[in-house]
């Protein structure tokens, strides 16, 4: 209806004696600004006067008259929008209807607001969710339809009279729609909270109690159980009996079914609150609990650990690690099921007790080949001694041991022989798979670990072999000690240091580089003739006749070796000179005569000189002296002299006779 003023405010406001009331209010007048405002208490319209009768709590007029009540009641509004009011303090007799008489220039309006003031502070109201389940977070709400700026209050939560630890969130509303104070508490109830009293307490600013509301919690939860066992420590020996009892300490709603579990698995045909185990075996050791269900779900008791004690079972040995490499560390672990755990162990190696080893683990810091074998153990506890299990095998791997190179041939070995060697070893793990030889050669390996050297060389000194598995082990080199005839035999001149001159003392040495065996004999020969059996051949005074081709031989028990032929050269001055004449020593004049100076010299004659019967040197220096034509006056005795680097030699006289030709005789 467009003829109405528009107001917004809470329909009813609540307060109590001595508190205050704050009335949030807005309005919109039909025309213009507010000119007059009167607050009535329980107004009644008087038809006769066409005015409202009632107690005037507040009056605001143009002339500004204000009644004494003005101090208690305040109009906090304005002339066009806000009509908020405050009454402080509020009294019991303020209950009823408040009338807001509003007048503008041309229009009037009476707006009614209900005020409910109680004698004492009224209680807040606790709101709970429809269902509360254990461990599920819920929000508890405490609502009080009161809030006033001038009268601070607080809401506190209590559980069984004790303040709750959880932090509550308090909110207030002072709006045209609603006026309230609300406290919200987030809370995860446990089953133990079932049936407990929760209180929301209204307090003034000083914490003084004003009022409260209480509720009883109805926490839905799975059955809560207690398990009892006889004997109480749940430790028994095989053959003993055990009784377990399940007691329900709480269930909401009531429980429906009962069952028993061992190690999380349900035990068949066990649906009563008592579990009887007769003549228990070690297999019955484990964690037992009872399970009781209701509509919320199953509840489980705490677990009872039933220990059925027994002597150790046959043991097994675990080796870390096998196979083991020699020098590495190895750990042995004795494993035996027993209850209580074994307190003592006895260890065996290849059936023989290992002294001092009484613990679950045995540690060998450096494994050696003889540590290989079977390791077993026996475990012991208070109930007895177990049996020795089958044991575990320790395989110790190591390089081949005590490797030797062995010569198979009869000794001695001679150059050119075929030599067979074998590579032997004492032990190896894993097995030897290959062999190596040093030095390398184009040799034959007819079978694994055997080396054949065809036509063995004189210089094959030592051979070493290695036997290899995952590792190679080298033997010490073995000397072949090959025997051979003397080598590199040669003739060497010891003296003189320079060339040999006739008459010199001369020594020749028969040299060789090596011989095995070392014992040797020497032989000198010239032109097939044996000259001596020493390493040296000596000439006290060499003559040209000693020159020639010499050889020396060196022999040992294996054979003999000759040197290359060595030429002995003797240097001497020209000798045995003679003059020979051609065509003869008697030549007819006019013919040709050739005189030749013949000699024996080393080096050969380099220079000739010719002399006549008067020892007069002739102007000719070649070996031949040619007279052509020859004259009778050429007749006479001639001689020649030969010269080389060593010296000179002269010939005896040779006479040339030149006779007249028949023509000359005829002319005479």
């Amino acid at each position: 209806d467009s003829s109405k003023w528009v107001f917004e405010h809470p329909e009813t406001l609540y307060a109590w004696e001595g508190a205050c009331v704050w009335i949030p209010c807005t309005y919109r007048a039909l025309d213009g600004d507010l000119e007059s405002f009167i607050l009535f208490h329980n107004p009644e319209y008087n038809k006769n006067t066409s005015k409202f009768d009632g107690t005037r709590l507040y009056e605001s007029t143009k002339d500004g008259k204000v009644p004494s009540e003005q101090k208690r009641v305040q109009f906090l509004g304005d002339k066009n929008k806000n009509c908020t009011l405050s009454i402080h303090p509020v009294h019991l007799n303020d209950s009823g209807q408040l009338g807001l008489r509003m007048e503008s220039k041309t229009e009037k309006w009476m707006e009614r607001i209900h005020l409910n003031v109680s004698e004492r502070p009224f209680p807040p109201h606790i709101q709970l969710p429809p269902e509360i389940q254990e461990s599920q977070e819920v929000t508890l709400t405490c609502l009080l339809n009161f809030s006033c700026y001038g009268y601070p209050i607080q809401l506190q939560w209590l559980l069984e009279g004790v303040p709750m630890r959880q932090a509550a969130v308090t909110s207030t509303s002072l709006t045209i729609k609603s006026v309230f104070t609300r406290s919200e508490l987030k809370f995860s109830p446990q089953w133990s909270h079932h049936g407990k009293i929760v209180t929301c307490q209204l307090q003034d600013a000083d914490g003084k109690f004003l009022s409260n509301d209480t509720v009883q919690l109805n926490v839905k939860h799975t059955p809560k159980l207690e398990i009892k066992v006889t004997p109480s420590d749940a430790i028994v020996r095989e053959g003993d009996s055990v009784t377990m009892t399940c007691e329900v300490s709480s269930s909401n709603p009531e429980y429906t079914t009962v069952s028993w579990l061992k190690d999380g698995t349900s035990l068949k045909k066990q649906n009563t609150f008592t579990l009887n185990l007769r003549e228990v075996t070690k297999d019955q050791s484990g964690k037992y609990c009872c399970q009781v269900s209701n509509d919320v779900g199953p509840g489980r008791s705490e677990e009872v650990f039933l220990q059925v004690q027994y002597a150790p079972e046959p043991s097994t040995v675990q080796i870390l690690h096998s196979p083991a490499v020699e020098g590495s560390q190895v750990e042995f672990l004795c494993m035996s099921l027993a209850n209580p755990l074994p307190t003592n162990y006895t260890w065996y190696h290849n059936g023989k007790e290992m002294q001092g080893r009484t613990e679950e683990k045995v540690h060998i810091p450096k494994i050696l080949p003889w540590h290989a074998g079977t390791y077993s153990c026996v475990a012991e506890n208070i109930l007895g001694t177990g049996q020795r299990g089958p044991g575990a095998e320790l395989d110790v791997q190591y390089p081949p041991k005590k490797v030797t190179t062995v010569i198979q041939n009869p000794m001695p070995i001679r150059e050119g022989d075929t030599v067979t060697l074998s590579c032997n070893y004492n032990s190896s793990n894993p097995s030897v798979t290959r062999y190596e030889w040093k030095p390398h050669g184009a040799w034959e390996e007819p079978s694994l670990g055997v080396l054949k050297i065809q036509n063995v060389g004189w210089d094959n000194t030592t051979i070493a072999c290695a036997a290899c598995n995952s590792w190679c082990s080298w033997a010490s080199p073995v000397a072949l000690n090959v025997q051979y005839a003397p080598r590199d035999v040669r003739v060497r001149k010891i003296k003189p240091l320079s060339e040999i001159h006739s008459g010199n003392s001369v020594s020749l040495q028969c040299d060789f580089s090596s011989s095995h065996p070392k014992e040797v004999q020497f032989f000198w020969e010239k032109n097939g003739r044996l000259l001596g059996k020493e390493s040296q051949l000596n000439f006290d005074s060499i003559s040209p006749e000693d020159a020639g081709s010499y050889s020396c031989w060196v022999n040992n028990s294996i054979g003999q070796t000759a040197s290359k032929a060595w030429t002995l050269e003797v240097l001497y001055a020209p000798r045995r000179l003679r003059v020979s004449m051609s065509p003869g020593d008697q030549v007819m004049e006019g013919k040709s005569a050739t005189l030749t100076c013949e000699s024996d010299a080393n080096p050969p004659v380099s220079h000739y000189t010719w002399f006549d019967w008067n020892n007069q040197s002739l102007p000719y220096h070649s070996q031949k002296l040619r007279l052509e034509p020859v004259k009778v006056q050429h007749s006479g005795a001639y001689w020649c002299q030969g010269t080389n680097s060593v010296g000179k030699g002269r010939s005896p006289l040779s006479t040339l006779t030149v006779y007249y030709s028949p023509e000359t005789i005829g002319r005479r």
């Epitope: 560390q329 190696h349 001092g356 080893r357 009484t358 613990e359 810091p365 003889w370």
Partner: antibody
Framework: EVQLQESGPGLVKPSQTLSLTCTVS????????ISWIRQPPGKGLEWLGV???????NYNSALKSRVTISKDNSKSQVSLKLSSVTAADTAVYYC???????????WGQGTTVTVSS | EIVLTQSPATLSLSPGERATLSCRAS??????IAWYQQKPGQAPRLLIH???TRQTGIPARFSGSGSGRDYTLTISSLEPEDFAVYYC????????FGGGTKLEIK
Amino acid sequence: EVQLQESGPGLVKPSQTLSLTCTVSGFSLTSYDISWIRQPPGKGLEWLGVIWTGGGTNYNSALKSRVTISKDNSKSQVSLKLSSVTAADTAVYYCVPHYYGYAMDYWGQGTTVTVSS
Amino acid sequence: EIVLTQSPATLSLSPGERATLSCRASQDINKYIAWYQQKPGQAPRLLIHYTSTRQTGIPARFSGSGSGRDYTLTISSLEPEDFAVYYCLQYDNLLTFGGGTKLEIK
């Protein structure tokens, strides 16, 4: 590097208790057994007893009533106690490590103990 | 308790000669025997363990053999530095030393 250091008083009075300590390094007492050996002047070697890796002990039967060997693995120390000593207990005392199936290859220099009043 | 008897008590030889030292156990010691060399003022030095295994760094002239109760240490060709006291040790059942053999220069 394996090292052994025997220490203790060089002079002990007759009837008193001889106490020696062996401090080891380079290995653990949980891996090696330790034996005590002695050598009187001009005489041979005599084994006194052993403490095994697990802490058990065995002693030379001739000395069993007088000898005690103990150890502290965390301190790497082994101790020897020989009670009611006489001049015959004068010797060089060695502590030596060994393990199952392996002879003693590390010997310290030993410590000389003289029993005299 | 195992008893070890070493023989001879003294052995007089010249450098280059072969030395044979014996050790006899009162019962089978399963090859668990070691040989030590000791020089005056020094700690014993391990030569051979497990009857015949030469310790690292020990010259090849030292060798060991034997089984059961009887064991031998052989020095193939004596060097001047080999003259010392030699002890055998059994470690098959606890530990026992032999009385020693003194190897002296003839």
